[in-house]
């Protein structure tokens, strides 16, 4: 005890009353009002507790402090007096803060700020919604994925910030009268091929597909190495020339020079050059057959092989090239007698007649085109008199029935067994290469050298053998009639044709040889 009679053991937050008693300081309380033992404590009174007599008034909060309390304005309110704290309701000057006015960018770009008592809310613009994790932040509504996609099925939905568009899909366009963008947009497929909006290379044909297009190699063309067919970027090359090369095992400088020319013409070939290229190939062939050079020194069988190879290749090349010609009739003739007649048409329903110096061909246009082939219909006839040199002594192989019939009406083959070629060799071709079994026959009228009396005249075609050579044959071809210098033939397939005179001695009048005019 000190000299003044005050207890020295008073607990924290208390003051002595006398030498034996203490009392808690204002704002603190103990179990009993007077503290008589040091074991007792003074605890802070929470003036802000519910049963407390303290009232701060509206728009304010009570904050308990050690031994006291403060009244402060609630968040979103501020004191008009400027005093940050106060003690009772009478000192309260709290009023609502207009946060929207204080900070115009409070709701960022896509909301409107609305002041409320003590706070604010963000009202989102159309096309936006409040973010669940941040109710004050407006975020874009993706109409395209939210299940409220209002676009027509012919369009695709494009989400924009705060909006959406219904756009035509690539390769589609708005139907007449329809907009392109609003939710009432309706689209239809664009035919890029007919509208010229395609990027197909000139070596391809454009095919329209739903919403797009593809580029396919032209007939007789193949995709360039490593480039797939039927793509937008397909580029093709002409197969016409690549396959027509000298026959294996034949050594002839004259023939090599001819094929060098063919390959040269193919190297920088373009569809627009078809006419010139056809003429140049036939010019080169005409020159080759006019001056065969070392070809004439080859064994007969090899000459027949060369002829077979030339006829076969020429047909393929002319078919391929003529598909790039424009509609109309073409006639070319060359110094040594080679002649080409060609008619190109979009398919028409009539018969076609091609006339040449020494041959006339008549057939039905419907034969010309393979179904589904988009290209023009082509009918062609080439007369190649010079081929006769290479086909001298070529064998004739008759069907067993014809062989028997000939033996019944004729005494048999005379000593020199090879038939004589009376006419020019002609080659007929169509844009359709499937000509082994024509639905209606083709008729040829040949002008030729005079027939020796009592000799058998036969309409023949060149059959390309398995060995790459070939022989004359009559299968599918019949002699309709013959007179001294002309013969009419009818065949059910196309190939290279001629009229032969077989060395048979006719014993009596043969009804087959009756002249039909």
């Amino acid at each position: 005890q000190d000299s003044r009679g005050c207890a020295r053991w008073c607990p924290q937050d208390s003051s002595c009353v006398n030498a034996t008693a203490c009392r808690c300081n204002p704002g603190f309380s103990s179990f009993s009002e007077i503290i008589t033992t040091p074991m007792e404590t003074c605890d802070d009174i929470n003036e802000c507790a519910t049963l407390s007599k303290v009232s701060c008034g509206k728009f304010s909060d009570c904050w308990n402090t050690e031994g006291s309390y403060d009244c402060v304005c609630s968040p979103g309110y501020e004191p008009v007096s400027g005093a940050k704290t106060f003690k009772n309701e009478s000192e309260n000057t709290c009023q609502d803060v207009d946060e929207c006015q204080q900070n115009p960018r409070l709701c960022k770009s896509y909301g409107t700020c609305v002041n409320t008592l003590g706070s604010y809310t963000c009202q989102c613009l159309p096309g936006f919604k409040l973010k669940p994790e941040d109710p004050k932040l407006c975020t874009d509504v993706n109409e395209c994925t939210s299940g409220q996609n209002p676009c027509h099925s012919s369009t695709h939905c494009l989400n924009n910030v705060g909006s959406y568009q219904c756009r035509c899909r690539p390769g589609w366009q708005p139907i007449p009268g329809s907009p392109n963008g609003p939710n009432n947009t309706v689209c239809e497929d664009v035919d890029e091929c007919s509208s010229g909006q395609h990027q197909c290379d000139s070596s391809t044909v454009c095919f329209n597909t739903v919403g797009s297009y593809s580029c396919r190699c032209r007939p007789g063309w193949k995709p360039r190495h490593g480039i797939p067919n039927n793509q937008k970027d397909t580029v093709c090359e002409d197969m016409t020339f690549s396959t027509w090369t000298p026959p294996p095992g034949v050594h002839s400088q004259t023939l090599s020079r001819f094929f060098d020319k063919v390959q040269d013409l193919g190297r920088d070939y373009k569809p627009g050059l078809a006419n010139n290229t056809i003429q140049s190939i036939l010019q080169a062939l005409d020159e080759l057959l006019e001056a065969p050079g070392d070809l004439e020194t080859l064994p007969r069988l090899q000459q027949h092989c060369v002829a077979s190879h030339l006829l076969d290749g020429l047909e393929d090349v002319l078919r391929g090239l003529s598909k790039n010609l424009s509609n109309g009739l073409l006639n070319f003739s060359y110094p040594a007698g080679t002649e080409l007649s060609l008619e190109v048409q979009k398919q028409v329903d009539r018969s076609v007649t091609l006339r040449q110096n020494q041959a006339v061909m008549q057939l039905d246009w419907n034969q010309a085109q393979k179904s589904g082939d988009p290209g023009p219909s082509v009918v062609g006839l080439v007369s190649i008199p010079g081929m006769g040199k290479l086909l001298a002594e070529a064998p004739l192989v008759l069907e067993p029935e014809k062989q028997m019939l000939l033996h019944e009406t004729h005494q048999g083959l005379l000593q020199d067994g090879s038939p004589i070629l009376l006419s020019d060799v002609i080659s007929a071709f169509l844009s359709n290469n499937d000509t082994q079994n024509l639905s209606s026959p083709v008729t040829f009228t040949f002008s030729h050298r005079s027939v020796i009396p009592r000799q058998k005249v036969l309409c023949v075609f060149w059959e390309h053998g398995q060995n790459g050579c070939g022989h004359w044959a009559t299968t599918g071809c019949s002699t309709i009639g013959t007179r001294d210098t002309s013969t009419i033939c009818r065949c059910t397939h196309l190939s290279s044709f001629a009229v032969l005179m077989a060395h048979y001695d006719v014993q009596e009048e043969d009804p087959v040889l009756t002249v039909i005019t």
Epitope: D260, R267, D268
Partner: antibody, heavy 118, light 106 residues
Amino acid sequence: QVQLQQSGAELARPGASVKLSCKASGYTFTNYWMQWIKQRPGQGLEWIGAVYPGDGDTMMTQKFKGKATLTADKSSSTAYMQVSSLASEDSAVYYCARGFTAYGMDYWGQGTSVTVSS
Amino acid sequence: QIVLTQSPAVMSASPGEKVTMTCSASSSVSYMHWYQQKSGTSPKRWIYDTSKLASGVPNRFSGSGSGTSYSFTIRSMEAEDAATYYCQQWSSNPLTFGAGTKLELK
């Protein structure tokens, strides 16, 4: 009749570019290669390259790749050659000519003289 | 590339004289063409496809050859034939010309 009309003479500074034109008439422009040939004074003929107007395809001699650009405008039947980064050795007469493998160059323009001088 | 070598580089001939010039190719060529050029004018196609005369070319001119060896002949020289003659091939890219043969009137 077939005619190839070339643009007029050009005088250009080193480093500049010139674009020469060759207007075709009297035939189907898209059906033939258009050749471009250079001839320096007192020298022979030198092939630059060719453009096929039908599809814009070009071929060029190695020496002129990067130097000359060949194009064709189907709508006006005109072939163009742009020569860039001009130097004194580009001073020459430039001819356009219609060409086909088997026929050679059957029709020629009158030539355009290009002079490069500082 | 195929190199075309023309010989002679320069030659002269009197009127009525036969003239022959040659064009030798470094590789085989299948289409050979010849052009005539007079000073200050554009070249003119003179012979194409080895031996075919271009339109308007007198028949005293002829061409022949094959493979790597080609020739150009004037049966009887005339004053108007004095010019430079070039051979040209397009059998392989790049297209090439010979350096030319200058034919002068003696």
